[in-house]
Every structure is written in structure tokens, then in C-alpha cells.
């Protein structure tokens, strides 16, 4: 990028520029018409008849340098060729010089500064490489020069430029002083100013456009050279915020439009809200979730916003004395999570009628919370209680929601308590076709043994028709018909008002191989 | 001898047209930015138009705008002024001269006269 | 445009200086040329480019041109000098011609 300085195609007005010494043959300002037939200034110069020594010098209006280290300046000119002209002595010439004085304001005058190299510092000696020919009566022919020149390094406020002729017969058709900068540039969303080239390449700091963010790493920085162009370089640049993309070439951050997010800075584009969210503004970094809807600490922000799971189903009670299982079908709707679990709660009422939350002495395997299997088993149930449990589906949302929770219960009533089982057999007589028993009245927790049930079976005769019963209202029994010097198991169960307990251990009995033996009484 | 010889002028009723010469001698014409310029009877000096070399462009005070028309003949040497709707007010002595010359390149004039004609008396009157 | 003003008249001694001034808004940044016309006869250049004498004008013949303000100087005045003198400039389209209204010299 160049920025002009001075520019003689644009100004409106006389240059009036300052000639030295104040004599014929000086440079001399005309006006005329450039190719789009604007009004442009010009200096001529022709005093090829000069004395020897004399210079004739041009030197421009103070120009504030802006900040700018080396300056260009660009001469369009045409130079008559000495050959062509009839009064051209030795002294003509086809060059001129160019210097350039720095001040820190506009202080020269007609005399000062002295008119020569040091204090003015020379550029360059500009020679045509275009010569004009002029025959007499004849327009002249000739290209146009145009030569660009470096000033500098500068740093005062500003400078004068300068022209010396020695003989030349010439026309500086126009100047352009320029400097150049880098263009301000946006790329990778960060915006790096226009910037002067103070040396060769210049470090130049980014800065992220709005509503962009730095980039992990270094931060951003591109080299100005000094000719103005940028260095090609990859740059760690900046990136969108949440809630904005990238736009018009990755020159800007465009906000989130409305039902559209970005939860997070970085490429990528704005997604459509997920399932039950929606943004009503646009610049959003998270869709809000739609009433009854929630995420969960741990989610995502660009999850989808779930809700708590409908109540557990069909809940079947399996009631084995003192122990329940509980087995439920999952929820209709699992609230569009995975992280289901179950969880019990439990009331118990007493024979009496009194209720409260069941106590500790109740086991749950697995546990009474945090199942994934449908299912449970419940231990220490008491007898004669009536218990309600109530199985609740949850998920990740479940504490984020308010309101009750939905459950399904179920009742469960204990049998009152049945007698213990009966372990304590003893073998009082045998013979080789039967066996008298005898055992030790069991404690009934409701009530008197009302009678017994014996149960045997030969050992190794397992199926059911080789089982048999024996009912007794004694703590006795004798078992007949049995085969002489086998083996039986036995097994023992009381009756109370509550019903049969269970089965005692199983109690290994032999029968007597012969009558001779008689009647022996056995201790179990 | 360089010289600017200006003729056609006279009496004119307004509303009438005239048409004014200049003959130049003693110099390259083609190569020079010619104008007119007229002063009335005790009047100070009043641009008129002015012309090119090459007849590429023209300039004309607002106060003759649309009415007066300046050209050349390079191959004659010869400046005109075609007057039309003439008016009492254009009753004046109109003089021809040249602009400062470049040393060589008929594009560029200097902001002076360096030579005017002796001029022509144009009286507009019924 | 601007707009050149001049004194209608001025006087002078055989011998004296006469100054005749010209004036107009940042007259100075523009270049200032001056005619004198002697009665019936055709505007001759005395000065242009504010200050530059063409061959054939006596030296006694200076000008200058600063701020708002251009001066004609003739020093030593003589009695042929007086006539009807005229400064002109550009305006600032660079293409129309100005001229100031004109100061009557009248040597004593």
C-alpha cells in the first residue's frame, strides 16, 4: 500500500516551488493538461548556455514524512537531447541530481539552507534514458522518464526534496512522494494494522477481531517488510467465541443465529440446537432447554436436554417368608438418557396398624439405590407386616427436576411367623422295618405346634414317588414298612395357626438288618 | 518580428455575430497557448477564452460562455473569435495574446502573457 | 474564484518608489503577474511569476508576493512609467485568468 505524500497531478494550485539563484534561465512553473485533460503543474529548465559552475536548483514545499522511515519519490520527466538543440554549448547536460534536506519544520528560505551537497544530501544523478529531439519549427518527440528514487532513513518531522540542474534542457512533467505500509490485513480472524516499516521487516502484534478469541500458543504476529507487503507466513491466529462463526473469509465473527449455537471457541460453524432446546437470541454459546427439560452437570453443553424417566412398570412380588423379590419392567420413557437407575422406598405397617419408614433391620440386594437391574431382593421382612414399597426410575436430570417423583408401588403382607424348622431328630428304636423318632418341641413365635410333618425317603430312591409323609400331633413318630438294613433321610416340619414351618435338616437313619437284633434304641 | 495582428472588428447591433482574427508572425504559433482578452472604454482588462496548441481544449470566461467560440488554424497562424448574441456590453477593444511558451513541449503553457496584438475595437449598438 | 483588488490610483515623485499593491485570499500561494498599459496602446509584461523581470523591463521594476497580498515596487519612478498597471493570477481550476481592477500611476 502507498500513501502519497505529495503528489504535483493532484494539486489544484500553483506549486510555487523555490528557485535558486534568482536569475534567467531558471526553473520555471508552467500548467497544462494531463491525458484526462485535468490541469497539472510542470517545471522546465533550459539554460544550456550556463556560465561554468552554475547550478540552477528547484526545491519542493516542506513535506511532513507521517511517521515514514524511507520515502520514494517518483520523477516523470523528459530531457532534450543536447544534439538537438543549436545553442547547446559543452556545458549542456542530460542528467540532473537529486537531494533532499530534513527538517523538523518548514524553516528553509529563499538562501538557506545553503544551497549544496552537505547540507543537502544527495539521492541520486537521474539520467534520461529517454532523450526528447526537437527540430526547429518541429514539435519535439520523446518518451517520457520515469525514475523512483529511495530517501532516507528519515527522522525529523519532514524534509524538502530537490532538484539541481547543470545544463540540461528539461521538463520534470511530475513527483509523486510516497511511502509505503502494510495495509491493514484481517486473516485467521485477527486484524493486524497498518502498519509504516520502520526497518528490512518489522514484527507487527495481532490482535483478535471482535468477538474472537486468542488461539492457544504464541500470539498472533506477522512481519511488515518494508516494501509494504506482508510476509507470507502461517499465523496462529485467533478464532471465534462461543456463540460466534467464522465469516466473510475468516475476516470476522458472525454471531449465532437465532435457534443455532457454538458451545465453544474454535473452528467450526453454529449447530442447530439439540432435541428440547432452543436459543431465542442469536450470539448463543448454549441452547436452553425447554421447560421440564435439563442437562446434567456432566453433560456436554451441546447435549441435548433430557427429563426425567416415567415410573418403572409392572412390578411383580415373589414372597418367600422373610424374604421378597422385586422385579419391575423398565419406564416407557427413559427421558432420552441412558444413566437409568432405580431406587426403592419402603413403608411398613405394623399387625396394629401403625406405619413408618421401614427400619434397618431390612437388607436390599444389590442395594435400595443405584440399581441398573430391574429387580431387587428384600430380606428381614417381619411376619404379619404389610410393607409398600415404591420402585422410582432416575436418570442424570432426575435431582435438577421439581415435583414429585413418579413411582410404582407395591404391597406386600407377611405371613404371621411359622414355627422353626425342626433340626434336633433322634432315633429312639429301630428295627428292620422301622424307625421311632422322637425331637424337641420347636419355640412357635404365634401360638402352640398344632401337629407335625414327617418326611421321609429311602437314600437314593430321589423321585417323588418314593417320598413319603407321616402327620403327628406328637413330637414322635414311628415310621413302618420300611426295608430291613437300608438308609433313610428324614426331615421334620411343625404346624402352627401361621402354617408349617420349614423342613428341618435332613437326618440319616439305618433299619436293623435282622429281628434277632431286637428293638435297639438309638441316639441320632 | 515577433507580432499579433488582430483585425474584423466594427459595429454590430446586439443580437448580431462577429468574427475577430489574429495573425501571428516572428514564432512557432502552432506551438503555443493562445487567448483573448478585452477591455471595455475605461474599463479594466477582462479574460476572455483561451485555447490550447493543439485546440485540445478551451476555457471561457462565464460571462461569454455559450455565446463566444475561440479556435485556430495552426497551418494559417491564425486565432478566431466567433461572437454571437452579441450584447451592448460586449462593446470593447479585444485583444489577442500568447501565453509564456514551453521550450519545447506545446502541452504546457506558462500563466502569462508575454505578447498581446495591439487589438480591435468591437462596438455593439443599435 | 478569487477576486484581485487594487487601489484605483496612485501618486508618486519623479525619483520616489511607488508600491502598488494587489490583494486576495492566499494571494501568496499563487503566482502574481503585472501589466502596464499606457493609454492606447496594447498591456505590456512587467513582472511575472511574482517577482521575474522578462528582458527589456528596466530593473527599477520589482515584485513580491506574500500572505494575502502582491506588490508591484518601482523604484526611482520616471515619468514614462506612468500609466494603468494590472496584476493577474489564475484561479484555481488553473485554466481561467483573473485580473485585478487596475491602479492608475500618476508621476507627479
Known amino acids: 500500500l502507498e500513501e502519497t505524500l505529495l503528489n504535483t497531478k493532484l494539486e489544484t494550485a500553483d506549486l510555487k516551488w523555490v528557485t535558486f539563484p534568482q536569475v534567467d534561465g531558471q526553473w520555471e512553473e508552467l500548467s497544462g493538461l494531463d491525458e484526462e485533460q485535468h490541469s497539472v503543474r510542470t517545471y522546465e529548465v533550459c539554460d544550456v548556455q550556463r556560465a561554468p559552475g552554475q547550478a540552477h536548483w528547484l526545491r519542493t514545499g516542506w513535506v511532513p514524512r507521517r511517521g515514514a522511515v524511507h520515502v520514494y519519490a517518483t520523477l516523470r520527466f523528459t530531457m532534450l537531447e543536447c544534439l538537438s538543440l543549436p545553442r547547446a554549448g559543452r556545458s549542456c547536460k542530460e542528467t540532473f541530481t537529486v537531494f533532499y534536506y530534513e527538517s523538523d519544520a518548514d524553516t528553509a528560505t529563499a538562501l538557506t539552507p545553503a544551497w549544496m551537497e552537505n547540507p543537502y544530501i544527495k539521492v541520486d544523478t537521474v539520467a534520461a534514458e529517454h532523450l526528447t529531439r526537437k527540430r526547429p519549427g518541429a514539435e519535439a518527440t520523446g518518451k517520457v522518464n520515469v525514475k523512483t528514487l529511495r530517501l532516507g532513513p528519515l527522522s525529523k518531522a519532514g524534509f524538502y526534496l530537490a532538484f539541481q540542474d547543470q545544463g540540461a534542457c528539461m521538463a520534470l512533467l511530475s513527483l509523486h512522494l510516497f511511502y509505503k505500509k502494510c495495509a491493514q490485513l484481517t486473516v485467521n480472524l485477527t486484524r493486524f494494522p497498518e502498519t509504516v516499516p520502520r526497518e528490512l521487516v518489522v514484527p507487527v502484534a495481532g490482535s483478535c477481531v471482535v468477538d474472537a478469541v486468542p488461539a492457544p500458543g504464541p500470539s498472533p504476529s506477522l512481519y511488515c517488510r518494508e516494501d509494504g507487503q506482508w510476509a507470507e507466513q502461517p499465523v496462529t491466529g485467533c478464532s471465534c467465541a462461543p456463540g460466534f462463526e467464522a465469516a466473510e473469509g475468516n475476516t470476522k465473527c458472525r454471531a449465532c443465529a437465532q435457534g443455532t449455537f457454538k458451545p465453544l471457541s474454535g473452528e467450526g460453524s453454529c449447530q442447530p440446537c439439540p432435541a428440547n432446546s432452543h436459543s431465542n437470541t442469536i450470539g448463543s454459546a448454549v441452547c436452553q432447554c425447554r421447560v421440564g427439560y435439563f442437562r446434567a452437570r456432566t453433560d456436554p453443553r451441546g447435549a441435548p436436554c433430557t427429563t426425567p424417566p416415567s415410573a418403572p412398570r409392572s412390578v411383580v412380588s415373589r414372597l418367600n417368608g422373610s424374604s421378597l423379590h422385586l422385579e419391575w419392567s423398565a419406564p416407557l420413557e427413559s427421558g432420552g438418557r441412558e444413566d437409568l437407575t432405580y431406587a426403592l422406598r419402603c413403608r411398613e405397617c405394623r399387625p396394629g396398624g401403625s406405619c413408618a419408614p421401614c427400619g434397618g433391620d431390612l437388607t436390599f440386594d444389590p442395594g435400595p439405590r443405584d440399581l441398573v437391574e430391574p429387580w431387587v431382593v428384600v430380606r428381614g421382612l417381619r411376619p404379619d407386616f404389610t410393607y409398600t414399597f415404591e420402585v422410582t426410575a432416575l436418570n442424570g436430570v432426575s435431582s435438577l427436576a421439581t415435583g414429585p417423583v413418579p413411582f410404582e408401588p407395591v404391597n406386600v403382607t407377611t405371613d404371621r411367623e411359622v414355627p422353626p424348622a425342626v433340626s434336633d431328630i433322634r432315633v429312639t428304636r429301630s428295627s428292620p422295618s422301622s424307625l421311632s423318632l422322637a425331637w424337641a418341641v420347636p419355640r412357635a413365635p404365634s401360638g402352640a405346634v398344632l401337629d407335625y410333618e414327617v418326611k421321609y425317603h429311602e437314600k437314593g430312591a430321589e423321585g417323588p414317588s418314593s417320598v413319603r409323609f407321616l402327620k403327628t400331633s406328637e413330637n414322635r413318630a414311628e415310621l413302618r414298612g420300611l426295608k430291613r438294613g437300608a438308609s433313610y433321610l428324614v426331615q421334620v416340619r411343625a404346624r402352627s395357626e401361621a402354617g408349617y414351618g420349614p423342613f428341618g435338616q435332613e437326618h440319616h437313619s439305618q433299619t436293623q438288618l435282622d429281628e434277632s437284633e431286637g428293638w435297639r434304641e438309638q441316639l441320632a | 518580428q515577433v507580432q499579433l495582428v488582430e483585425s474584423g472588428g466594427g459595429l454590430v447591433q446586439p443580437g448580431g455575430s462577429l468574427r475577430l482574427s489574429c495573425a501571428a508572425s516572428?514564432?512557432?504559433?502552432?506551438?503555443?497557448?493562445m487567448s483573448w482578452v478585452r477591455q471595455a472604454p475605461g474599463k479594466g482588462l477582462e479574460w476572455v477564452s483561451n485555447?490550447?496548441?493543439?485546440?485540445?481544449?478551451?476555457h471561457y470566461a462565464d460571462s461569454v460562455k455559450g455565446r463566444f467560440t475561440i479556435s485556430r488554424d495552426n497551418s494559417k497562424n491564425t486565432l478566431y473569435l466567433q461572437m454571437n448574441s452579441l450584447r451592448a456590453e460586449d462593446t470593447a477593444v479585444y485583444y489577442c495574446?500568447?501565453?509564456?511558451?514551453?521550450?519545447?513541449?506545446?502541452?504546457?503553457?506558462?500563466?502569462?502573457?508575454?505578447?498581446w496584438g495591439q487589438g480591435t475595437l468591437v462596438t455593439v449598438s443599435s | 474564484d478569487i477576486e484581485l483588488t487594487q487601489p484605483p490610483s496612485v501618486s508618486v515623485a519623479p525619483g520616489q518608489t511607488a508600491r502598488i499593491s494587489c490583494s486576495g485570499d492566499?494571494?501568496?500561494?499563487?503566482?502574481v503577474h503585472w501589466y502596464q498599459q499606457k493609454p492606447g496602446q496594447a498591456p505590456v509584461l512587467v513582472i511575472y511569476?511574482?517577482?521575474k523581470r522578462p528582458s527589456g523591463i528596466p530593473e527599477r521594476f520589482s515584485g513580491s508576493n506574500s500572505g494575502n497580498t502582491a506588490t508591484l515596487t518601482i523604484s526611482g519612478t520616471q515619468a514614462e512609467d506612468e500609466a494603468d498597471y494590472y496584476c493577474?493570477?489564475?484561479?484555481?481550476?488553473?485554466?481561467?485568468?483573473?485580473f485585478g481592477g487596475g491602479t492608475k500611476l500618476t508621476v507627479l
Open positions: 511569476y511574482d517577482s
Open positions: 495574446a500568447r501565453k509564456g511558451m514551453s521550450f519545447y513541449n506545446n502541452k504546457y503553457a506558462k500563466s502569462m502573457f508575454d505578447l
Open positions: 492566499n494571494l501568496g500561494k499563487k503566482y
Open positions: 493577474s493570477a489564475w484561479t484555481t481550476t488553473m485554466m481561467h485568468i483573473v
Open positions: 485555447i490550447t496548441s493543439s485546440s485540445s481544449m478551451t
Open positions: 516572428g514564432f512557432t504559433f502552432n506551438n503555443s497557448w
